[in-house]
């Protein structure tokens, strides 16, 4: 059982510092990009990261959302990436769910933040290249210290 | 034929609670996200609450956020809506309706049940 | 929130008439990315449960008669009765689903002259 907390509004950075933004195909992409372009792109640009109460501690619960006319949610559904047409739900009565995150720090680097998914355990945000872009996926941790699961969280509140 | 009936309803006091239920049959209930809707006496229409088809994803309107819990039981095809800390303004017919859409959010009522009174007052 | 004003709050309409009726929100509920208007119409006779009849601002609901029509698009709405029957006689309400809560018009009394 999930319980909706606060939210804040963040800018969220690969290891290579490039932005995560979600595109006009509702993809959510990774590129590199100027504080000012940063700027220039929101709110394609800007997260909203709401945070939940587990009735199951497992690090801090999360969802992911944008709002480019209407607020759409991040889901791993199918462990396939995608932007869900949904605000933040106040609940979600289930231990696990598509849509929430676990946000954890990595051991050793309090500002790099690692987001495993409640509904497939092992599993973490990644960003990963396909061609020329780099995609927001769901990849199985296969070994320690994988900096392709490592971001950065910039509160913009 | 698609029915929805709503039991529970009553006079209670301010700070008192109130269980509604709702008995759904004609159509696979576990497959449609399910609204709570009320009217006041003789006022328009107010959006209550939404609990998903699947996915466990709940919503609530400001008015009743942290007093009203909303729940479903597919096996007895049921939706209910637990009132807490009920007050005057409560006061409605609380509708019980099938929301359109079967996936994760809230869109239009395609039936509605006939409604079940709560009168809240000393 | 969206703040949905409809107008007029009553109408009288003869019998074989046309009866409109307006519905603003106050926001647009036009989605570009598909082009659909989150607007949905219902009408509710008295001592009755609504019923909808509109949805996506101009999808007429199975078995509602084809005298009532939706029209309008982004924030400025209209349900409109071509030709008034006893039987329409009620109060309709219009509903945004663009974003929670969900919100309604405060409704417009339709009524025989």
């Known amino acids: 059982y999930f319980g909706k907390l606060e939210s804040k509004l963040s800018v969220i950075r690969n290891l290579n510092d490039q932005v995560l933004f979600i595109d006009q195909g509702n993809r959510p992409l990774f590129e590199d990009m100027t504080d000012s372009d940063c700027r220039d792109n929101a709110p394609r640009t800007i997260f909203i990261i709401s945070m939940y109460k587990d009735s199951q501690p497992r690090g801090m619960a999360v969802t992911i959302s944008v709002k480019c006319e209407k607020i759409s949610t991040l889901s791993c559904e199918n462990k396939i990436i995608s932007f869900k047409e949904m605000n933040p739900p106040d609940n979600i009565k289930d231990t696990k769910s598509d849509i929430i995150f676990f946000q954890r720090s990595v051991p050793g680097h309090d500002n790099k933040m690692q987001f495993e998914s409640s509904s497939y355990e092992g599993y973490f945000l990644a960003c990963e290249k396909e061609r020329d872009l780099f995609k927001l996926i769901l990849k199985k941790e296969d070994e320690l210290g994988d900096r392709s699961i490592m971001f950065t969280v910039q509160n913009e509140d | 034929e698609v029915q929805l009936v709503e039991s529970g309803g009553g006079s209670v006091q301010p700070r008192g609670s109130l269980r509604l239920s709702c008995a759904a049959s004609g159509f696979t209930f576990s497959s449609y996200s399910m609204n709570w809707v009320r009217q006041a006496p003789g006022k328009g229409l107010e959006w209550v609450s939404y609990f998903s088809s699947s996915g466990g994803i709940i919503y609530y309107a400001d008015s009743v956020k942290g007093r009203f819990t909303i729940s479903r039981d597919n096996a007895k095809n049921s939706l209910y809506l637990q009132m807490n800390s009920l007050r005057d303004e409560d006061t409605a017919v609380y509708y019980c309706?099938?929301?359109?859409?079967?996936?994760?959010?809230?869109?239009?009522?395609?039936?509605w049940g006939q409604g079940t009174l709560v009168t809240v007052s000393s | 929130d969206i703040v949905m004003t409809q107008s007029p709050d009553s109408l009288a309409v003869s019998l074989g008439e046309r009866a409109t009726i307006n519905c603003k929100s106050s926001?647009?509920?036009?989605?570009?990315?598909?082009?659909?208007?989150?607007l949905a119409w219902y009408q509710q006779k008295s001592g009755q449960p609504p019923k909808l009849l509109i949805y996506?601002?101009?999808t007429r609901e199975s078995g509602v008669p084809d005298r009532f029509s939706g029209s309008g698009s982004g924030t400025d709405f209209t349900l409109t009765i071509s030709s008034l029957q006893a039987e329409d006689v009620a109060v309709y309400y219009c509903?945004?689903?663009?974003?929670?809560?969900?919100?309604f018009g405060g409704g417009t009394k339709v009524e025989i002259k």
């Open positions: 926001q647009t509920v036009l989605y570009r990315s598909n082009n659909k208007n989150y």
């Open positions: 509903q945004q689903y663009y974003s929670t809560p969900l919100t």
């Open positions: 996506w601002a101009s």
């Open positions: 309706a099938r929301d359109d859409s079967s996936g994760y959010y809230p869109y239009f009522f395609d039936y």
